[in-house]
Amino acid sequence: PEPPTACREKQYLINSQCCSLCQPGQKLVSDCTEFTETECLPCGESEFLDTWNRETHCHQHKYCDPNLGLRVQQKGTSETDTICTCEEGWHCTSEACESCVLHRSCSPGFGVKQIATGVSDTICEPCPVGFFSNVSSAFEKCHPWTSCETKDLVVQQAGTNKTDVVCGPQDRLRA
């Protein structure tokens, strides 16, 4: 018969012959022959291959370097890489999460719109009229100004985006 020019899915063409690819978690040791199927062996400890492949070497699992603020989020298997994330208070600098930086704090006048995660930084927003933040924080939202009226008080000093209103007693009407 004519030697094949293309092979089925999960096969590869070598020396005019279709050989099975190695399954995820295994590497190629020897191509198939006219007598035998492809020779594959499992990836070693701390190695992986995540696709059907003809790789002669497995990939090393990612190392989550604690010196860079990283920790293991999900341990790798022979078929998957290790997933790193950042220690509490830190977040990844890139999608690959190769290093971490400290979560940003929102300055006075800004509040936290979205708290940071291991993979995303703090999102800040300016405090709108009626709200304030007087601290630098990675967690605090803008707080609403105190409502003097509900306390039977009057505004003695107007609030800003950084300060609360100051309430005081109402002036007594003189007789």
Epitope: I14, N15, L28, V29, S30, D31, T33, F35, T36, E39, L41, P42, G44, E45, R54, T56, H57
Partner: antibody
């Protein structure tokens, strides 16, 4: 044609060195692990060493071969080698090269090494 | 290293007999076991690999079984061309790779 051909076997004195070659043809040498197996006259088969496929090709040896024997390959020449040092009378054997590690579907015809004074 | 203990070392049988050869590994080798046939003056020929897979072109009267440490080669009905020496080869694969052959079983005509 897919084949392996060993060469380099000789009659040498104890303590001598010898390098065996195995020329591969008809298949992709780079994507195949290779092994050396020997057989003393009238005796059984004995695994000597293996080298994995790919550029860096990790090497593994029988405990008795470590330190004295070295398996290597030249991908550009599609040739497998076995460097044998400090040869002893008990190394007298036919040396076969074979394709694979956990199973050996393709063998050469063998080359005879005789160690004698 | 691993040791492969093959038995018997020789056996006499007649054409048509069912023949069984066993091989025991000194430690678990999963299914990394192969069987070979060798005739005088020739290189070994692969019969079975991965403990039970028949190499292409090998007659179906040859079969292999087992995993871990205990393996068997069976010839269901011995033919004249089957008189030869048979070897098992086990490979330990882990942090290192170590292979070893059994001592061989010579099958002779009764």
């Amino acid at each position: 044609e897919v084949q392996l051909e060993e060469s380099g076997g000789d009659l040498v004195q104890p303590g001598a060195s010898l390098r065996l070659s195995c020329a591969a043809s008809g298949f992709d040498f780079n994507s195949n692990a290779m092994s050396w197996v020997r057989q003393a006259p009238g005796k059984g088969l004995e695994w000597v060493a293996s080298i994995y496929a790919g550029g860096s090709g990790s090497t593994y040896y029988a405990s008795w071969a470590k330190g004295r024997f070295t398996i290597s390959k030249d991908t550009s020449k599609t040739t497998l080698y076995l460097q044998m040092n400090s040869l002893r009378a008990e190394d007298t054997a036919t040396y076969f090269c074979a394709r694979g590690i956990t199973r050996l579907p393709l063998w050469g015809q063998g080359t005879l090494v005789t160690v004698s004074s | 290293d691993i040791q492969m203990t093959q038995s018997p070392s020789s056996l006499s049988a007649s054409v048509g007999d069912r023949v069984t050869i066993t091989c025991q590994a000194s430690q678990s080798i999963s299914s990394y076991l192969a069987w070979y046939q060798q005739k005088p003056g020739q290189a070994p020929k692969l019969l079975i690999y991965d403990a039970s897979k028949l190499a292409s072109g090998v007659p179906s009267r040859f079969s292999g079984s087992g995993s871990g440490t205990d393996f068997t080669l069976t010839i269901s009905s011995l033919q004249p061309e089957d008189f030869a020496t048979y070897y098992c080869q086990g490979t330990y694969y882990g942090s290192t790779t170590i292979s070893a052959f059994g001592q061989g079983t010579k099958v002779v005509i009764k």
